[in-house]
């Protein structure tokens, strides 16, 4: 099996304020085992947007059923977008570890820009 790649096919996505934004991400392999997380920004100050394993993310829904066997699609939809949501979003694969999961590979990022609500 080829080594896993994290594919974010869109470099940028533009959404009108108030709408939902779909951020696409998929894996080329099911291995290694471990959760997916979405972050806004990179580095130490990045903001967690979604954690497949745990947590409550009321504005975020997954596009596919993540529990489905052989699922490779980890795209998310963020509802009620505001200008504060603008930024670059990264889909990150973690490898299952003990006691903590270890970051394995990140997607290239998708820049979300927010347009003014059409009048």
């Amino acid at each position: 099996e080829d080594e896993l790649q994290v594919i974010q096919p869109e470099k940028s996505v533009s959404v009108a304020a108030g709408e939902s934004a779909t951020l696409r991400c998929a894996m080329t392999s099911l291995i290694p085992v471990g959760p997916i997380m979405w972050f806004r920004g990179a580095g130490a100050g990045r903001e967690l947007i979604y954690n497949q394993k745990e947590g409550h993310f009321p504005r975020v829904t997954t596009v596919s059923e993540l529990t489905k066997r052989n699922n490779l699609d980890f795209s998310i939809s963020i509802s009620n977008i505001t200008p504060a949501d603008a930024g670059t979003y990264y889909c990150v694969k973690f490898r299952k570890g003990s006691p903590d999961d270890v970051e394995f590979k990140s997607g290239a990022g998708t820049e979300l820009s927010v347009r003014a609500k059409p009048s």
Epitope: E1, D2, Q5, I7, P9, T22, R24, A26, M27, T28, V63, S64, E65, L72, D73, S75
Partner: antibody
């Protein structure tokens, strides 16, 4: 530019065999899943077969399972479809098509060849 | 096996009009795996929409896709002369990667 060129079509008798080829250029062939799709005269599109980028997994429509074999040679940037036990209902234009992303079968097929015609007739 | 059903079979419209094409899956599917293609006579298909709602590169914004679950729609807001063609939806992700039967958009 990104291009797919099919060849190998022709007229064959029922029960006969043909091997189609698809030569790829302009992209990293070894990174993408590939597909064969056919279209019978005056009919719609029918997905036939797909293969992962590494060639490690293959997928077939029920209508061709056991008769057709998809394969690829990444060193030659070429996709193949070996067609055996051909039937009249296999008569169609055969297109090869590239997966849109490196993830097999995700989002769609973004590059298509112009097709090669296979006619099965006695 | 999931069946993709397109309707109507033929849509007769004039340039400038709005076209609404439907694609229905026999069971719920992820929108990530729904694509739309355009095919003109004698030509190969062209990817229009992927992930149910995202336009492929170079596709004009008069084309839009929507839907989720079992019901998906391709809308052409104002038909241009070059838009008269056959349109197919396709379910990806699983095998077989089923196409719908197509909708022909013809000039009225």
């Amino acid at each position: 530019q990104v291009q797919l060129v099919e060849s190998g079509g022709g007229v064959v008798q029922p029960g006969g065999s043909l091997r189609l080829s698809c030569a790829a250029s302009g992209f990293t062939f070894s990174a993408y899943g590939m597909n064969w799709v056919r279209q019978a005269p005056g009919k719609g599109l029918e997905w036939v077969s797909a293969i992962r980028a590494s060639g490690g997994a293959t997928y077939y429509a029920d209508s061709v399972k056991g008769r057709f074999t998809i394969s690829r040679d990444n060193s030659k940037n070429t996709l193949y479809l070996q067609m055996n036990s051909l039937r009249a209902e296999d008569t169609a234009v055969y297109y090869c098509a590239k997966d849109f992303t490196e993830v097999v079968g995700w989002l769609g097929m973004d590059v298509w060849g112009q097709g090669t015609t296979v006619t099965v007739s006695s | 096996e999931i069946v993709m059903t397109q309707s109507p079979g033929t849509l007769s419209l004039s340039p400038g009009e709005r076209a609404t094409l439907s694609c229905r899956a026999s069971q719920s599917v992820s929108s990530s795996y729904l694509a739309w293609y355009q095919q003109k006579p004698g030509q190969a298909p062209r990817l229009l929409i992927y992930g149910a709602s995202s336009r492929a590169t170079g596709i004009p914004d008069r084309f839009s896709g929507s839907g989720s679950g079992t019901d998906f729609t391709l809308t052409i807001s104002r038909l241009e002369p070059e838009d008269f063609a056959v349109y197919y939806c396709q379910l990806l992700g699983s095998s077989p990667r089923t196409f719908g039967g197509g909708t022909k958009v013809e000039i009225k």
